[in-house]
């Protein structure tokens, strides 16, 4: 049993880091493998993560952490029984993938303006709370070419667009994701999408 692709890990900068790797063949990750992780400080405990399958030869493990301090560093040991398959380290603050925003809502009752709101995935006391910016993806269910991205570079988790920038009388979906420039994070996963029927009053044409 060998590791084909070494573990790569990302942190949500709160309490969970996720590590993924690939084995050289089909593996029952939860019964055959264990990922041990330990904060590199005196008195820290070694913790054991039981991986889950992520495709035939892929494994994923969710590492629980009490907090993320900027200088934290963890040792990682991947074991198959008594055999050490891989040894590495991981600094959560250098590999951040924010949590996905939630509660995406489209408000259609604001005089031909669409107001999209969502929730910041972090509590106010988390460092990322005031550092997230967002991308909103809106697409038509009827027309695959009608696909657009709005970059929200301000902190408020909302976006206003004129309903008339979209086609009237058809259904649209929207989703949102986040990133934080300060930590050069990757993008979060997309939020669950929400659907609405776009309709607005066409302005009267004057001849």
């Amino acid at each position: 049993m060998k590791v084909l692709q070494e573990p790569t890990c990302v942190s949500d900068y709160m309490s969970i880091s996720t590590c993924e790797w690939k084995m050289n063949g089909p593996t029952n990750c939860s019964t055959e493998l264990r990922l041990l992780y330990q904060l590199v400080f005196l008195l820290s405990e070694a913790h054991t993560c039981i991986p889950e399958n992520n495709g035939g030869a892929g494994c994923v493990c969710h590492l629980l952490m009490d907090d993320v301090v900027s200088a934290d560093n963890y040792t990682l040991d991947l074991w198959a029984g008594q055999q050490l398959l891989w040894k590495g380290s991981f600094k959560p603050s250098e590999h951040v993938k924010p949590r996905a925003p939630g509660n995406l809502t489209v408000h259609t009752n604001v005089s031909d303006t669409l107001l999209l709101t969502w929730s910041n995935p972090y509590p106010p006391d988390n460092y990322l709370y005031n550092h997230l910016t967002y991308a909103v993806n809106i697409w038509s269910e009827n027309d695959p070419a009608d696909f657009r991205i709005y970059n929200v570079t301000y902190l408020e988790p909302s976006l206003r667009i004129a309903a008339s920038t979209l086609k009237s009388g058809i259904s649209y979906r929207a989703r949102v994701r986040a990133w934080a420039q300060c930590y050069n994070t990757t993008w979060s996963e997309w939020s669950p999408s929400t659907k609405w029927h776009n309709s607005y009053r066409e302005p009267f044409e004057q001849h």
Partner: antibody, heavy 120, light 107 residues
């Protein structure tokens, strides 16, 4: 050996700002893994965690008091300062500082505490 | 915020008794839990960290167990110096919070 000592005013008027200083020896906040936290205890009541600062200058605050608290460190003087703005009689308490080690996030050494009364 | 609930709030026992104090978290805190002892007019003292690890210099009659939401501090044979108030405290995420305390008194 590790020692910590809190200092600050014993009496503060409502709406004023309370400044508390923790002076410590036996460890350094320039050492990786070290932190100092503040905890308070109103008379006859339970302990309440307020704030902490780590060697890397990461700061953490109580949710309910965050808007009123500021924690800072002076590594060269071996001091940590906590300020509480707009104090109220409910802030009357014994205030403790404690050393924290990142390895187990436990408060393993405590100061003797300093008693603060908020009253006009 | 995670709430920590200790029971009982007070307890009477005799020297030599085996005593158990429980602490319940309002949500999973895994093993990120510490126990402290406080005597009147004194600062708290760390007894147990990470739910079950005994702090250096603390007598072996003290032990901790549990994980998730339910934790226990046990004193196997009470000594006169153990009569005090005991607090649990979690450190899973911010803010850290303490339990309301358990006052252990002489019967």
């Amino acid at each position: 050996q590790v020692t910590l000592k809190e200092s600050g005013p014993t009496l503060v008027k409502p709406t004023q700002t309370l400044t508390l200083t923790c002076t410590f020896s036996g460890f350094s906040l320039s050492t990786s893994g070290m932190g100092v936290g503040w905890i308070r205890q109103p008379p006859g009541k339970a302990l309440e965690w307020l704030a902490l600062i780590w060697w890397a200058d990461d700061k953490r605050y109580s949710t309910s008091l965050k808007s009123r608290l500021t924690i800072s460190k002076d590594t060269s003087k071996n001091q940590v300062v906590l300020t509480i703005t707009n104090v109220d009689p409910v802030d009357t308490a014994t205030y403790y500082c404690a050393r924290i080690t990142r390895g187990n996030s436990a408060m393993d050494f405590w100061g003797q505490g300093t008693s603060v009364t908020v009253s006009s | 915020d995670i709430q920590m609930t200790q029971s009982p709030s007070s307890l009477s026992a005799s020297v030599g008794d085996r005593v158990t104090i429980t602490c319940r978290a309002s949500e999973n805190v895994y093993s990120y839990l510490n126990w402290y002892q406080q005597k009147p007019g004194k600062a708290p003292k760390l007894l147990i960290y990470n739910a079950k690890s005994l702090q250096s210099g603390v007598p072996s009659r003290f032990s901790g167990s549990g994980s998730g939401t339910d934790f226990t501090l046990t004193i196997s044979s009470l000594q006169p110096e153990d009569f005090a108030t005991y607090y649990c405290q979690h450190h899973y995420g911010i803010p850290w919070t303490f339990g309301g305390g358990t006052k252990l008194e002489i019967k």
